[in-house]
């Protein structure tokens, strides 16, 4: 027989020879980090066919690291479901707890003994410090000094000293989240008031209000013979400006001989051919829209309108 087979878990006792005679026996022992559990044989014999009788290293078992208990409020999860050396142990904490220590331990061989690469971690309860205080507002549970996981606080704005209330910008409720960090930034309390939206040759059709505060929504339509340039719906944003800007109502052009206009006073279009003119002075033709450069207010239109001159 030629050289006997080699194995992952056991090694030949003595030096291998190039050739073995029929009937000759070789013995194996478990490699370092493995141990023998009877009764399986750990030897083989060169038989008459010049082949070695079947043998396996199933009798040699890997050394295993000591059993690790689940950490309190967490779990120890052996990779590949085994504690044998060369493998890893993963640690995870239950929701509302966070890991202090190593997330992964390695089962390592020290001499002939398998031991873990470090101390098992612990799972500590997620705690948050009090959330930020905000100007012109407050939050619930302001007297609490330590917050647990998923504890929530809700912000509200103080009464304003003037005629206009403070608006809450952002989410009113935040909660103590993973990593002891609040779920989002604290909201802001400030006066948000948009100007009265003036639309020449049109009018507001919904969202009527005494004043227009944060998130106020207004809709417009144009008079007959005018079409909407811009969005028919605008919202008061946190900067006290209308978003999108207040639309304009522009005069529908008289039909040309070649192609009649496909626009009605209720059609919303966007035009790329016009550029706002600066505020004009002096007499102006009555069909031109009144002049305004105020943000969100009507501006005169060049191009289409001037082509009527």
């Amino acid at each position: 027989c030629e050289e006997p087979p080699t194995f992952e878990a056991m090694e030949l006792i003595g030096k291998p020879k190039p050739y073995y005679e029929i009937g000759e026996r070789v013995d194996y022992k478990c490699k370092k980090g493995y141990f023998y559990i009877p009764p399986l044989a750990t030897h083989t014999i060169c038989d008459r066919n010049h082949t070695w009788l079947p043998v396996s290293d199933d009798a040699c078992y890997r050394e295993t690291c000591p059993y690790i208990r689940d950490p309190l409020n967490g779990q120890a999860v052996p990779a590949n479901g085994t504690y044998e050396f060369g493998y890893q142990m993963h640690f995870i904490c239950n929701e509302g707890y966070y890991l202090i220590g190593e997330e992964i331990l390695y089962c390592e061989l020290k001499g002939s003994v398998a031991i873990w690469s470090g101390k098992p971690p612990i799972c500590e309860k997620v705690l948050c410090t009090p959330p930020p205080k905000i100007k012109n507002g407050k939050h619930t549970f302001s007297e609490v000094e330590v917050f647990e996981y998923l504890d929530a606080v809700t912000y509200s704005c103080d009464p304003a000293p003037g005629p206009d209330p403070f608006s809450l910008i952002g989410e009113s409720t935040i909660y103590c989240g993973d990593n002891s960090v609040w779920s989002r930034a604290a909201p802001e309390c400030k006066v948000v008031k948009c100007r009265f939206p003036v639309v020449e040759n049109g009018k507001q059709i919904s969202g009527f209000g005494k004043k227009f505060y944060y998130k106020a929504t207004v809709m417009f339509e144009c008079d007959k013979g005018f079409y909407l340039d811009g969005s028919d719906t605008i919202v008061c944003d946190s900067n006290s400006t209308w978003d999108p800007p207040v639309p304009k109502c522009l005069k529908v052009l008289p039909p040309s001989s070649t192609k009649p206009p496909a626009l009605s006073h209720s059609v919303s279009t966007s035009s790329t051919t016009k550029s706002p003119a600066s505020s004009a002075s002096g007499p102006r033709p009555t069909y031109k829209p009144p002049v305004s450069n105020y943000p969100g207010y009507p501006k005169p239109e060049e191009g289409i309108l001037d082509s009527l001159d």
């Epitope: 008031k193 100007r195 009265f196 003036v198 639309v199 020449e200 040759n201 009018k203 507001q204 009527f208 005494k210 004043k211 505020s279 009144p290 002049v291 305004s292 450069n293 105020y294 943000p295 207010y297 501006k299």
Partner: antibody, heavy 118, light 107 residues
Framework: EVQLVESGGGLVQPGGSLRLSCAAS????????ISWIRQSPSRGLEWLGV???????NYNSAFMSRFTISRDDSKNTAYLQMNSLKTEDTAVYYC????????????WGQGTLVTVSS | AIQLTQSPSSLSASVGDRVTITCRAL??????LNWYQQKPGKAPKLLIY???SLHSGVPSRFSGSGSGTEFTLTISSLQPDDFATYYC?????????FGQGTKVEIK
């Protein structure tokens, strides 16, 4: 609190021109939206137009071809330029500070009388 | 332009009376209506904005109501200082327009 004082009124012949001034004291005219309103026994109160803080304007279309509103920030004054005056333009002319961007006329000047007569 | 019609054009009342002035719009103006008071030789003064909101410094005997096309200014108990002319004004649509006025005189 800003005070508005109108001036420039007087007697003018039909077809003539006149420029009314609205001087602001105690505040900057450019910080406010200024409207011009006139009043006559025959026509009552009529809103003429507005100049916004950025210098943009809106007009009552009935007067748009003859009246122009402007502002000179260095003089802290708003103006109403009136051309081609008619006898029916005879009225007391007021400048007024629009209330905080809303069309509520809360702060009026004392008014200046314009008489158009031959 | 949106036309506003006030009624009555004038009325006579005594101190302590309850006085009601009506302003009608030819088309709906939501609540976009203001009321002004004017005394002879003076500029008008804002009394009420947005139909029913009292302007600062205006006595609580003044109140406003209505919506759409019909609006009312009420003086609950007329005082000597209240004898004046009253105007309504709409601002839903340019040009902003005024009513013709209602003169409240001493009976």
């Amino acid at each position: 609190e800003v005070q508005l004082v109108e001036s420039g009124g007087g007697l003018v012949q039909p077809g003539g021109s006149l420029r009314l001034s609205c001087a602001a004291s105690g505040g900057s005219v450019s910080s406010y939206d200024i409207s011009w309103i006139r009043q006559s026994p025959s026509r009552g109160l009529e809103w003429l137009g507005v100049i916004w803080t950025d210098g943009g304007t809106n007009y009552n279309s009935a007067f748009m071809s003859r009246f122009t509103i402007s502002r000179d920030d260095s003089k802290n004054t708003a103006y109403l330029q009136m051309n081609s005056l008619k006898t029916e333009d005879t009225a007391v002319y007021y400048c007024e500070r629009v209330y905080d961007g809303y069309p509520w006329f809360a702060y009026w000047g004392q008014g200046t009388l314009v008489t158009v007569s031959s | 332009a949106i036309q506003l019609t006030q009624s009555p054009s004038s009325l006579s009342a005594s101190v302590g009376d309850r006085v009601t002035i009506t302003c009608r719009a030819l088309q709906g103006i939501s609540n976009y209506l203001n009321w002004y008071q004017q005394k002879p030789g003076k500029a008008p003064k804002l009394l009420i904005y947005y139909t029913s909101s009292l302007h600062s410094g205006v006595p609580s005997r003044f109140s406003g109501s209505g919506s759409g096309t019909e609006f009312t200014l009420t003086i609950s108990s007329l005082q000597p200082d209240d004898f004046a002319t009253y105007y309504c004004q709409q601002y839903i649509k340019l040009p902003w327009t005024f009513g013709q006025g209602t003169k409240v005189e001493i009976k």
